[in-house]
Structure formats: structure tokens, C-alpha cells
């Protein structure tokens, strides 16, 4: 995880610490680098990256995705709605990142780094969103049963699930990064 700097708060309300944006930006780019490394191993190990049968596995997944209504795109941008969506989406991705932990051989540490860095990113963003409405956290029981269900899939579906999680998480972070740069 890239080291965070001491925040430099200024007195007036809503005035942001001068270093908070840099920390968020660097954190997302660090996670994206980690995802690239994991995708490399996944694509080298199987042909999932070229597969056209993604829809079969996608039926089992409810991966967070940016939509127009979330306010994170240039068209219809809404910074507060968008920030809530980013944090909610990252919290929802946590169970999928937990699933990834036993899915890599040579990149085991990288998978752990992506998971831990995402937790840190969530903390940074929650600090930025401190004046916004409460953000709903996924239900731990639902997450536990989802994890069990994913781990019980056959090998092909597990490989496809891994590929889809990484691809979706990458797309989600890229959209988040673009939006957060305006905030």
C-alpha cells in the first residue's frame, strides 16, 4: 500500500486536506497495477480472457457496475451520488476480492495487496464523504453464503468468475478514478 501522507487540513468547512486527493489517486492506480498483474496470470493460465461464454458465469454474479443513474459519468455527473456509489461498490466488491485470495499461485501476495489496498481506499473515501448520507454496508451473512456458493463452483466456472471479477473491478476503478479527479 503506498504510504499516506499527513493530511494538511484547513479551517473552513468543506475545504479538503491538500493531500487527500493525491492519496486516493495513487491508491487507485496502485490497485489497478495489481489487477493488471493478476489478470496476466489468469490469462496465461487459461483461455478465459478470449472466452465468449462469459454470460454463463455472469448469471451467478452480481458485480457492482457503474450506470448512468449513479452520476459518475460526464453525462449526468453528480458528485455526491457518485461518491456514495463508489464507496458502496467497493464495499460490495470486498466479498469478491476475498474469493480471489486462494485463486492465485505465483501472484498470491499481489491478490492480498489488492484486497488490503482496497480496504485502505475505502477508508480514504469514507473520510472524503464524511458529510454525505450514511452508506449501506453489505450484509455479512449474505456475503458468507455468496462466498460458499462461488467456492463450490466447478473449475471452469471458478476460472471464469476470477476473470470476470478482475475485469469488472478494473472497469469500476477506472470509472471511479475519472470521476474522483473532478472532486
Amino acid at each position: 500500500v503506498p504510504p499516506g501522507e499527513d493530511s494538511k487540513d484547513v479551517a473552513a468547512p468543506h475545504r479538503q486536506p491538500l493531500t487527500s486527493s493525491e492519496r486516493i489517486d495513487k491508491q487507485i492506480r496502485y490497485i489497478l497495477d495489481g489487477i493488471s498483474a493478476l489478470r496476466k496470470e489468469t490469462c496465461n493460465k487459461s483461455n478465459m480472457c478470449e472466452s465468449s461464454k462469459e454470460a454463463l458465469a455472469e448469471n451467478n454474479l452480481n458485480l457492482p457496475k457503474m450506470a448512468e443513474k449513479d452520476g459518475c459519468f460526464q453525462s449526468g455527473f453528480n458528485e455526491e451520488t457518485c461518491l456514495v456509489k463508489i464507496i458502496t461498490g467497493l464495499l460490495e466488491f470486498e466479498v469478491y476480492l476475498e474469493y480471489l485470495q486462494n485463486r492465485f499461485e505465483s501472484s498470491e501476495e499481489q491478490a492480498r495487496a489488492v484486497q488490503m489496498s482496497t480496504k485502505v481506499l475505502i477508508q480514504f473515501l469514507q473520510k472524503k464523504a464524511k458529510n454525505l448520507d450514511a452508506i449501506t454496508t453489505p450484509d455479512p451473512t449474505t456475503n458468507a453464503s455468496l462466498l460458499t456458493k462461488l467456492q463450490a463452483q466447478n473449475q471452469w466456472l471458478q476460472d471464469m468468475t476470477t476473470h470476470l471479477i478482475l475485469r469488472s473491478f478494473k472497469e469500476f476503478l477506472q470509472s471511479s478514478l475519472r470521476a474522483l479527479r473532478q472532486m
Epitope: 468543506h14 493531500t19 487527500s20 493525491e22 492519496r23 458528485e79 479527479r181
Partner: antibody, heavy 119, light 106 residues
Framework: EVQLVESGGGLVQPGGSLRLSCAAS????????MHWVRQAPGKGLEWVAK????????YYSDTVTDRFTFSLDTSKSTAYLQMNSLRAEDTAVYYC????????????WGQGTLVTVSS | DIQLTQSPSSLSASVGDRVTITCSAS?????MYWYQQKPGKAPKLLIY???NLASGVPSRFSGSGSGTDFTLTISSLQPEDFATYYC?????????FGQGTKVEIK
């Protein structure tokens, strides 16, 4: 045509106040963060402040913190810089600039408005 | 704050010359930008994120570098390129600018 037009500059005494306006046209104002950058006569560029598209977050340089306030009126596609406790060293041409969507680059700039602080 | 030092501060060149301006940062920066400014005018974005050409900017302009050392190159100087060039960085707020490099006609 995409453009930003600044107004409100002029001569003001030290300790005085001034409000600059930046009117946007030719593009949808709502998704873009806005900035103020200034340039003292014969000198280089100095970043002053940023405001997020909906005005929820603002950032200021140390030289103007607690004296300047950046605000928006999205219904008028206009950004404002309220400058209080002005000093001689605030004398400069003030430019407003739009932040490129998805990047930190400042891609569209106004023509600038001159603020002179002198007794 | 991150300091940016441009070199040279000024240079004289002829139309058709290859011109190189460097920008050195006091510490490693996340993003680097280059601007062109003509007397009495607002700055104009040339290069963003180290090496991406801004919309409408001729391909004779290019940017390179990473970490602390960055370069703006004009492959073949044109009459309209005589101006002052500024590097600008973002690595969190505040944005900072170099002191400028004035490109004059020889």
C-alpha cells in the same frame, strides 16, 4: 464555442474585497471542476483554487486560504472567487480554467481579469 | 510544495529548429502538463499526463519523461511557436508551475 469569460477585476485598496465572476458557455457546466490561476505582472503562473463540479469540495493554495472563497451558481453556469483582506501581492491577472473531464489538466482558460491592490 | 525548475529560462531559435525544454521536479510527480502562453493571452494546454497531445495541438509538439525529469520537444519550430512555455505538475494540491521558458526568434 466553448469559452470562459472572467469579470469583476479592478483597483482595490489593501484590506479590501472583490468578487470575480467566471461565466461559462458552449459546454455543459455541471460535470467540470473549475479553477482559478493567477499571474502577477511580468511573472509566472500560480494556482489559486479549485472547486468540484457541485461545489461540495474546495481546495486553496496556502497563500489565499481563509481569505478567498470559491463558489458556484450552476443554474447560471458561473463560478465566483470572493477575495477578502486583499494584499499588494495579490495583484495579478486572474484566469479561471476548466478541468478536463477524467484528468487533472486545465484545458479551457478564460481571457483573464486584472486585479490591482494598491493604496 | 513541489518545485519545478525549467531550463533554459530563455532560448533563441530559428524556424525549422528542433527545440527541447526540460522541467525538473524537486520530488517525483504523478502528472505533468505543458502550456504555451503568448503575450497578453491565456495559457493554452499542449500536453497532458506527460505525453498526451491536447486537442488541436500540432504533432510537432511532444512530451516525455517520468518521475522528476520531463521534456517538451518541438520537432520543427514554426513562426507561431514563439511564446513562453510552462510546465505544470499535479501530485495533490497545490498544482505548481515552472518559472517558464521564453522561446524567441534568433
Amino acid at each position: 464555442e466553448v469559452q470562459l469569460v472572467e469579470s469583476g477585476g479592478g483597483l482595490v485598496q489593501p484590506g479590501g474585497s472583490l468578487r470575480l465572476s467566471c461565466a461559462a458557455s458552449g459546454f455543459t457546466f455541471s460535470p467540470f471542476a473549475m479553477h482559478w490561476v493567477r499571474q502577477a505582472p511580468g511573472k509566472g503562473l500560480e494556482w489559486v483554487a479549485k472547486i468540484s463540479p457541485g461545489g461540495s469540495w474546495t481546495y486553496y493554495s496556502d497563500t489565499v486560504t481563509d481569505r478567498f472563497t470559491f463558489s458556484l451558481d450552476t443554474s447560471k453556469s458561473t463560478a465566483y472567487l470572493q477575495m477578502n483582506s486583499l494584499r499588494a501581492e495579490d495583484t495579478a491577472v486572474y484566469y479561471c480554467a476548466r478541468q478536463k473531464w477524467g484528468y487533472y489538466a486545465l484545458d479551457i482558460w478564460g481571457q483573464g481579469t486584472l486585479v490591482t491592490v494598491s493604496s | 510544495d513541489i518545485q519545478l525548475t525549467q531550463s533554459p529560462s530563455s532560448l533563441s531559435a530559428s524556424v525549422g529548429d528542433r527545440v527541447t525544454i526540460t522541467c525538473s521536479a524537486s520530488i517525483s510527480v504523478s502528472y505533468m502538463y505543458w502550456y504555451q502562453q503568448k503575450p497578453g493571452k491565456a495559457p493554452k494546454l499542449l500536453i497532458y499526463d506527460m505525453s498526451n497531445l491536447a486537442s488541436g495541438v500540432p504533432s510537432r509538439f511532444s512530451g516525455s519523461g517520468s518521475g522528476t525529469d520531463f521534456t517538451l520537444t518541438i520537432s520543427s519550430l514554426q513562426p507561431e511557436d514563439f511564446a513562453t512555455y510552462y510546465c505544470m505538475q499535479w501530485s495533490g494540491y497545490p498544482y505548481t508551475f515552472g518559472q517558464g521558458t521564453k522561446v524567441e526568434i534568433k
